[in-house]
């Protein structure tokens, strides 16, 4: 399946909006700095399967969607912004959706993509816990958006090496 | 708020498949993965796998592998899990559960569905 | 498999009393991955807590719950009438997931 450009630009899209999206200087909130651990031997160009790297985007991506749709989170964000990100998301999803189908039918997932599924899900679970313990403060939110744009920004370079593998 | 509403129960007979449905609202229902888990009488819980409703992919226990096939209509918001081969063991209620991250794990469940399988 | 045992299988209290409930690993779980459910006759599991120590919304704060590793524990401080019911330990930790068999709490 080849993931559309317009995918590659709505991914950028989204990165520009989170970047946008920053309210607070994160230099004031080094002391929330957290390891969240970020899954990147599920997304490696080295030894990942096209079908498990495309799973583990619309998982990212799902999550991501998710975890920015909640009450606390709408409280955090400029509303506009929020908007046009859930737009974004919303569209890497249809994307994704027909490339997950695409690659393996609506068969079973292989074993090897059950587990970069549940790493990226895992991932996400650090995440609500570390938001949820610092009760969803804005430098909480800030370090999370942070970690976000980098998981972002390393998969977008992934999609990118995706292509050319194609 | 979240429901998840499943079909009625169901008597088989040995060899027969049985198709159950879990019918959600109050969310969005291609967000977030639906799982499945039997609990035989008076036995303890058992997770039989999970659909992502968004498109459609599984993930199975091994141990219903060859038997278990879930499934999703996006129109109806409804999940469904189909046993076949059945025997006097898959005599259980089986419960839909959504998925979800830190409290929302499993938050919801569906009111359970007894299927009976009697010769 | 990630086999959970629960223990006792049954324990015997009065209300006021302090219940404790254990729940043991085959193999590490982190503690992220670890819930409990309690389940009521005729009724489906309702979360109790979250994570090996969170109490889930609506839960009140007699529940507690800890450990880490391959040994965690729910705590009841003071047990109330409502209180007698199966509790079951769960692990989302690996594929498949898991349910400890069950400990059922019940009045002496």
């Known amino acids: 399946c080849d993931l559309p450009q317009t995918h590659s630009l709505g991914n950028r899209r989204a990165l520009i909006l989170l970047a946008q999206m920053g309210r607070i200087s994160h230099f004031s909130c080094l002391k929330d700095r957290y390891d969240f651990g970020f899954p990147q031997e599920v997304f490696d160009g080295n030894q990942f399967q096209k079908a498990q790297a495309i799973s583990a985007f619309h998982e990212m991506i799902q999550q991501t969607f998710n975890l920015f749709s909640t009450k606390d989170s709408s409280a955090a964000w400029d509303e506009t912004l929020l908007d046009k990100f859930y737009i974004e998301l919303f569209q890497q999803l249809n994307d994704l959706e027909a490339c997950v189908t695409q690659e393996v039918g609506v068969e079973e997932i292989a074993l090897m993509n059950e587990d970069s599924i549940l790493a990226v899900r895992k991932y996400f679970q650090r995440i609500t816990l570390y938001l949820m313990g610092k009760k969803y403060s804005p430098c909480a939110w800030e370090v999370v958006r942070a970690e976000i744009m980098r998981s972002f920004s390393f998969s977008t370079n992934l999609q990118k090496g995706l292509r050319r593998k194609d | 708020q979240v429901q998840l509403v499943q079909s009625g129960a169901e008597v088989k007979k040995p060899g027969a498949s049985v198709k159950v449905s879990c019918k959600a609202s109050?969310?969005?229902?291609?967000?977030?993965?639906m799982h499945w888990v039997r609990q035989a009488p008076g036995q303890g819980l058992e997770w039989m796998g999970e659909?992502?409703?968004?498109?459609?992919?599984?993930i199975y226990n091994e141990n219903f592998k060859s038997r278990v096939t879930m499934t999703r209509d996006t129109s109806t918001s409804t999940v469904y899990m189909e046993l076949s081969s059945l025997r006097s063991e898959d005599t259980a209620v089986y419960y839909c559960?959504?998925?979800?991250?830190?409290?929302?794990?499993?938050?919801?469940w569906g009111q359970g569905t007894l299927v009976t399988v009697s010769s | 498999e990630i086999v959970l045992t629960q223990s006792p299988a049954t324990l015997s209290l009065s209300p006021g009393e302090r219940a404790t409930l254990s729940c043991s690993a085959g193999?590490?779980?982190?503690?992220?991955?670890l819930y409990w459910y309690q389940q009521k006759p005729g009724q489906a599991p309702r979360l109790l807590i979250y994570?090996?120590?969170n109490l889930a919304s609506g839960i009140p704060a007699r529940f507690s719950g800890s450990g880490s590793g391959t040994d965690f524990t729910l705590t009841i401080s003071s047990l109330e009438p409502e209180d007698f019911a199966v509790y079951y330990c769960?692990?989302?930790?690996?594929?498949?997931?898991?349910f400890g068999q069950g400990t059922k709490l019940e009045i002496k």
């Open positions: 769960h692990q989302w930790s690996s594929y498949p997931f898991t």
């Open positions: 994570s090996t120590s």
């Open positions: 559960a959504r998925g979800g991250l830190g409290p929302a794990w499993f938050a919801y």
């Open positions: 109050g969310y969005t229902f291609t967000n977030y993965w």
């Open positions: 193999s590490s779980v982190d503690s992220s991955y």
């Open positions: 659909i992502n409703p968004s498109h459609g992919r599984t």
